[in-house]
Interface confidence: medium
């Protein structure tokens, strides 16, 4: 069976939207009005992995682009990147672990924990117009909580 996917946008808990900046980078900033069209639409695929009531494994691709968020070690540090894939082979049910995030729902907010690097989360800075990154702390200055907005296909 084909992998189940839905289209959505994400905003952090400060209501910053995610936009592309350069070919392989996401940034978080406040958008209003027509500028909202700039925000990235994700194709969230429900993939194989450890699952529970509040934890669902997903892959986050960019809609109509052959790019997926992935987690890799760079200089011994878990790092978030946008990785180019062969569109003929993705998405798939059994995604490589670096592409998998545990979507965790807490108090109507979502966290995205790296399956490859437990306790590392998709994060944004308090500051405007800074890169989206993989952070190793929750509850600190960096933001790890998001809301999801469904987008019709």
């Amino acid at each position: 069976a084909p992998v189940r996917s839905l289209n959505c946008t994400l905003r952090d808990s400060q209501q910053k939207s995610l936009v592309m900046s350069g070919p392989y980078e996401l940034k978080a900033l406040h958008l209003q009005g027509q500028d909202m069209e700039q925000q990235v639409v994700f194709s969230m695929s429900f993939v194989q992995g450890e699952e529970s009531n509040d934890k669902i494994p997903v892959a986050l691709g960019l809609k109509e682009k052959n790019l997926y968020l992935s987690c890799v070690l760079k200089d011994d540090k878990p790092t978030l990147q946008l990785e180019s894939v062969d569109p003929k082979n993705y998405p798939k049910k059994k995604m490589e672990k670096r592409f998998v995030f545990n979507k965790i729902e807490i108090n109507n907010k979502l966290e995205f924990e790296s399956a490859q690097f437990p306790n590392w989360y998709i994060s944004t800075s308090q500051a405007e117009n800074m890169p989206v990154f993989l952070g190793g702390t929750k509850g600190g200055q960096d933001i790890t909580d998001f809301t999801m907005q469904f987008v019709s296909s």
């Epitope: 980078e25 890799v72 760079k74 200089d75 790092t79 990154f133």
Partner: antibody
Framework: QVQLVESGGGLVKPGGSLRLSCAAS????????MSWIRQAPGKGLEWVSY????????YYADSVKGRFTISRDNAKNSLYLQMNSLRAEDTAVYYC???????????????WGRGTLVTVS | SYELTQPPSVSVSPGQTARITCSGD??????AYWYQHKSGQAPVLVIY???KRPSGIPERFSGSSSGTMATLTISGAQVEDEADYYC???????????FGGGTKLTVL
């Protein structure tokens, strides 16, 4: 004001010696690892040497190993590069650079001086 | 020996987006750093760890990395951005520190 100022450059004959100095100000020098980087005329940048904040660990580029000696005096907020057996190919502007350290692989250079010119001829 | 490859020159008009690339076999597992160097001045760190911008660096500077390619992007390049730009990283062992050959950015 946070800055690094190099001095000691000049003209020297092949086989000669020179000692470069770098004076740091505006930050806690003893907290930082430091490096020397050089740029030959019309060429790119080349990392030369690196010293830990305590001076206990030192690295050199292969091109200068055995000829150059890096040292520091934290009490004087100063970094040094003793250059011996100089060759024509050592002709370059030499920069000292502050080197933040957050793990074995995380060296980079976040503050540079304007450099001092060494000419071997 | 390990090499980082940059284009020798990039030209843009003021207000346009300038992209400078840096390719190296170890970049999938090693961070890229970018330096701006104006003649007679101290080099300035403009991007560290692929995409982080030091305080005081204008927002128009951004960095990204994918696979063996790192990219420095200057959105809305200004005349004062004319300079040589160098990428910096290490080989896969982390033992050899290397600068790219440099890219001369012309904003005319």
């Amino acid at each position: 004001q946070v800055q690094l100022v190099e001095s000691g450059g000049g003209l020297v004959k092949p086989g000669g010696s020179l000692r470069l100095s770098c004076a740091a100000s505006g930050f806690t020098f003893s907290d930082y690892y430091m490096s020397w980087i050089r740029q030959a005329p019309g060429k790119g940048l080349e990392w030369v040497s690196y010293i830990r904040s305590s001076g206990s660990t030192i690295y050199y580029a292969d091109s200068v190993k055995g000829r150059f000696t890096i040292s520091r005096d934290n009490a004087k907020n100063s970094l040094y590069l003793q250059m011996n057996s100089l060759r024509a190919e050592d002709t370059a502007v030499y920069y000292c650079a502050r080197t933040p350290y957050s793990g074995r692989y995380h060296w980079y250079f976040d503050l540079w001086g304007r450099g001092t010119l060494v000419t071997v001829s | 020996s390990y090499e980082l490859t940059q284009p020798p020159s990039v030209s843009v008009s003021p207000g346009q987006t300038a992209r400078i690339t840096c390719s190296g076999d170890a970049l999938p597992i090693k961070y890229a750093y970018w330096y701006q160097h104006k003649s007679g001045q101290a080099p300035v760190l403009v991007i560290y760890e692929d995409s982080k911008r030091p305080s005081g660096i204008p927002e128009r500077f951004s960095g990204s990395s994918s696979g063996t390619m790192a990219t420095l992007t200057i959105s809305g390049a200004q005349v004062e951005d004319e300079a040589d730009y160098y990428c910096y990283s290490t080989d896969s062992s982390g033992n050899h520190r290397v600068f790219g050959g440099g890219t001369k950015l012309t904003v005319l």
